[in-house]
Interface confidence: low
């Protein structure tokens, strides 16, 4: 049922009133305000912005707005001892040094506290040695190097291009390969779209531009020193040696001008195929080491960054629900940026600000949502999702009992082509129905629905006439809510055309050139895409907080469970002989999925027919819907990843950004042919199948008739 059935409001305060109140001009104004100076986590500037947002949210009409602080491990370059990489000759003389900073964009030359490019949480060190080019440093790239090409990275400095996977996975892979250091660079093949000028004349990355970013492998732990618990005043903190997820080798990022100087001298093996070659004018030889005349030259890294416990601040705003104040719908996005944050995060923060303003306007006119809405401005997302994770750790008991949904609100745009949505299957129908009611901002779709342009530009690979919705992975603040706590989650933003723009992320991601002007000049001059994203995010929050019956459809979970079971079965069937030898069967899992499908179907019928005016019955049915996501949580977590507890979805072990289905089974099967003890390996596959079977069956039973 739609939100207009909520009993606590006058008819005019419906979804349409909320959406009509959202204004593109306001989002533009807020974005400009949030991007004039850097707001790096742990700095005074970001604390001041937190206080400004607190003040404005109060003005907008929220019931309460609080700052919550935590003392977490952050990482910064040494201001007097800069990080760089050099080529040294046989005498140890530095004959080439990488740049110490990005040339600031016009108009920003006198801005102070622009942090130079660095890899956050890199240890200090000055390794030197031969270079090995490892492509994207993915698992498969190291397989190619080590297994096919017989190239040993042990004792070598590896150079990897950014893109395809989360940088932390690249560093982990390099460590496992025995590398002594990692150089990350942006190749024009991935960060320079053909036919577009580089900033400030276009949205492409200039040669001096560099992507900052953390290189942690936290696996959902939050603050590396206080895994599982909030980093508050009385927290026990681990020593640095026991900290979670810190890299053990120095890492540093560079732009493609500097990369050219390192890569042009590379010798050794040729690249195995064209997928290893970018578009610099260099050989893309793998190495190890430099060629011929340059073979006596080495590469040396000079990394002097420090990690220190630093105070961070979240802003938490509350709009109390009129009917079910103990049910929370959360809208959250981060506030901290690497530099100006023109896209990441402030294009998202500006949208959240306007959504808060619209909700506040309705509240000032006497309206309240049915359920409580919490708004969050997270700190230290760029340092490992720290603000959101610490807050969720502190409030975990409340959240697991009261959390209805979490909607993420980082960057509103990564392109201006079409909508992109990742969410729990429970929200599929909500998103479809909402986008059918919204107007498309796309050229050529005037007067058409957002659903129509989205479906045309990003069709579902499985169902014709429907748009693609992707799995949730990680790399953003929904992680703790979805992967750890099992709260139904979703995210939406405008994206690029993935067919024609093959580069990873947007070219200026995490660089100094990610400015207000980038957005205003090149991505969204009319701020119409920002407005659409505000309508989608805000509309989802409105429905989740205001619908009499929660807008979740458990039948969509049944459909994907069958799809994921088929997928993992097909992966396992690549080893038919071993499955026979070790008696590996997926029959139990398919049976559980069948049971889930039947029970979900019956539940949906009861949901349609029950007496909505009976508050006890209504609450009971809503609780079954709310707790369904929670039912997929295994309290023991995934193997070696205790904070990834969702049995159906987890971030890929090979790419934090990507979601993997039935991750426990998937990881048990991965590269199983190379395992030393096949009996043990297939035993683990069987164990994971049994866990998945139990979890699906148990989740199904939460939907059964209560008595």
């Amino acid at each position: 049922k739609s939100s207009s059935e909520a009993t606590n409001i006058t008819p005019k305060h419906n979804m349409k009133a909320f959406l009509d109140e959202l204004k593109a001009e306001n989002i533009k104004k807020f974005l400009h305000n949030f991007t004039q100076i850097p707001h790096l986590a742990g700095t005074e500037q970001n604390f001041q912005l937190a206080k400004q947002i607190q003040s404005q949210w109060k003005e907008f009409g929220l019931d309460s707005v609080e700052l919550t602080h935590y003392d977490v491990l952050l990482s910064y370059p040494n201001k007097t001892h800069p990080n760089y990489i050099s080529i040294i000759n046989e005498d140890g003389n530095e004959i080439f040094n990488t740049s110490l900073f990005e040339p600031p964009p016009a108009g920003y030359e006198n801005v102070s506290d622009i942090v130079p490019p660095f890899s956050a949480f890199s240890p200090q060190g000055m390794p030197e040695g031969d270079l090995v080019y490892v492509n994207y440093a993915r698992t498969e790239d190291f397989f190619k190097l080590e297994r096919d090409m017989k190239i040993n990275c042990s004792g070598k400095i590896v150079i990897a291009r950014y893109g395809k996977v989360f940088r932390g996975n690249k560093v982990k892979n390099a460590q496992l390969a025995g590398a002594t250091g990692v150089i990350l660079y942006s190749d024009p093949a991935d960060y320079f779209a053909p036919g577009v000028k580089s900033y400030p004349d276009g949205w492409n990355l200039p040669g001096g531009g560099v992507q900052r970013g953390n290189i942690l492998n936290l696996n959902g732990a939050g603050d590396p020193l206080t895994p599982g618990y909030p980093a508050n005043e009385y927290a026990y903190r681990r020593g640095i040696a026991e900290a979670v997820g810190l890299p053990s080798i120095p890492v540093h990022p560079i732009g493609y001008y500097d990369a050219q100087k390192l890569l042009e001298k590379m010798g050794g093996s040729a690249s195995p195929d064209s997928s290893w070659r970018g578009s610099l004018k260099v050989p893309y030889n793998v190495g190890p080491g430099f060629t011929g005349n340059f073979s006596t030259q080495k590469v040396k890294m000079h990394i002097h960054s420090t990690s220190e416990v630093t105070r961070i601040y979240n802003v938490i705003g509350t709009l109390r629900g009129a009917v079910e104040p103990d049910r929370y719908v959360i809208l959250g996005g981060h506030r901290d940026s690497w530099v100006f944050g023109g896209i990441d995060p402030q294009s998202g923060a500006a949208v959240v600000h306007e959504i808060v303003r619209s909700f506040g306007t309705l509240k000032k006119e006497g309206w309240r949502p049915r359920r409580t809405i919490l708004f969050a401005s997270w700190d230290a997302e760029e340092f490992g999702l720290l603000g959101s994770t610490e807050w969720a750790e502190e409030n975990s008991r409340l959240l697991q009992e009261r959390g209805v949904a979490y909607i993420n609100a980082d960057s509103s745009i990564e392109g201006n082509y079409t909508l992109r949505v990742d969410c729990t299957p429970l929200m599929y129908s909500l998103v479809y129905n909402l986008t059918k009611e919204l107007e498309s901002p796309d050229e050529g779709f005037e007067g058409k629905s957002l659903y129509e342009s989205w479906t045309k530009k990003s069709p579902s690979p499985e169902f014709s006439g429907m748009p693609r919705i992707s799995k949730l992975g990680s790399g953003n603040d929904f992680e703790v809510f979805f992967q750890r706590l099992g709260i139904a989650s979703g995210r939406a933003r405008y994206t690029k055309n993935w067919e024609t723009n093959k580069f990873s992320s947007y070219p200026l991601y995490h660089s100094v050139y990610e400015t207000y002007e980038l957005v205003e000049k090149f991505y969204d001059p009319m701020f119409k895409y920002h407005l659409t994203v505000a309508q989608v995010r805000g509309g989802m929050v409105f429905e989740l907080a205001n619908s009499v019956v929660l807008p979740f459809d458990c039948r969509d979970y049944a459909v994907v469970l069958r799809k994921y079971a088929d997928k993992i079965y097909n992966i396992s069937m690549k080893h038919p002989q071993e499955m026979k030898t070790y008696s590996v069967s997926f029959d139990s899992l398919f049976s559980a999925v069948k049971n889930f499908t039947e029970i979900a179907s019956k539940f949906s019928e009861r949901l349609r027919d029950f007496d909505k005016s009976n508050p006890i019955l209504l609450r009971m049915m809503n609780d079954q819907l709310m707790f369904l996501e929670r039912a997929f949580i295994d309290p023991l977590g995934l193997p070696d990843r205790p904070f990834y507890r969702h049995v159906i979805y987890a971030p890929s072990s090979h790419n934090k950004y990507a979601g993997e289905s039935f991750p426990g089974i998937y990881d048990a099967l991965f590269d199983i042919e190379s395992k030393v003890d096949p009996s043990q390996a297939w035993g683990e596959v069987k164990r994971q199948i049994s866990i998945a079977t139990f979890t699906v069956q148990a989740a199904a039973e939460t939907l059964s008739e209560v008595a």
Epitope: M149, G268, A270, S274, N285, T291
Partner: antibody, heavy 124, light 106 residues
């Protein structure tokens, strides 16, 4: 100037092994990869494998189990060893140097210098 | 493995003619296509690399073109010394593979 010269046994009995040496001059094996290619009588060229500057190798998948390529940088020699020869291994065997093309936008695997080849007959 | 197909195994032409030899790959090879000339005495020479780049010392009457899976070698103003067999080879993905060859006769 750049030269590559193959030397082999000429005649090999079936099921026996073949060893061919490629001796190079005018360049160093530390800077250039070497490929082996063969051509059966009246047929086309078949790529056998490559040894990279660092000593890593890649082989034609159909011959992988029988083929081994090694080298001695100091002697400027590359060695091809093939086991279990059959009559259809009768061919002219070439070694070829990979070109190093710098200063252009991409990198290309092309063999820009070839030996004159050595003829191998497998017969009892 | 990527299969390289030269559909024409032999080709007759007159001196001064322009001839074109074609080559098809079983999958997209991203322009990593080389052409070799093998003289009747067995000597092999690289003519063109990366679809259209002329190897130094090769006469400009040789040219190459193509993209994706379809490539061709053209010889304008055919000369007696061009009598040879021509092979295409993909340098995109290991293992590298050759086409079957096209024998050019006068």
């Amino acid at each position: 100037q750049v030269q590559l010269k193959e030397s082999g046994p000429g005649l090999v009995a079936p099921s026996q092994s073949l060893s061919i040496t490629c001796t190079v001059s005018g360049f160093s094996l530390t800077n250039y990869a070497i490929s082996w290619v063969r051509q059966p009588p009246g047929k086309g060229l078949e790529w056998l494998g490559v040894i990279w500057t660092g000593g890593g190798t890649h082989y034609n998948s159909a011959l992988k189990s029988r083929l081994s390529i090694s080298k001695d940088n100091s002697k400027s020699q590359v060695f091809l060893k093939m086991n279990s020869l059959q009559t259809d291994d009768t061919a002219r065997y070439y070694c070829a140097r990979k070109g190093n093309y710098y200063g252009s936008s991409l990198y290309y695997y092309a063999m820009n210098y070839w030996g004159q080849g050595t003829s191998v007959t497998v017969s009892s | 493995d990527i299969q390289m197909t030269q559909t024409t195994s032999s080709l007759s032409a007159s001196l001064g003619d322009r001839v074109t030899i074609s080559c098809r790959a079983s999958q997209d090879i991203s322009n990593y296509l080389n052409w070799y000339q093998q003289k009747p005495d067995g000597t092999v020479k690289l003519l063109i690399y990366y679809t259209s780049r002329l190897q130094s010392g090769v006469p400009s009457r040789f040219s190459g073109s193509g993209s994706g899976t379809d490539y061709s070698l053209s010889i304008s103003n055919l000369e007696q010394e061009d009598i040879a067999t021509y092979f295409c080879q993909q340098g995109d993905t290991l293992p590298y593979t050759f086409g079957g060859g096209t024998k050019l006769e006068i």
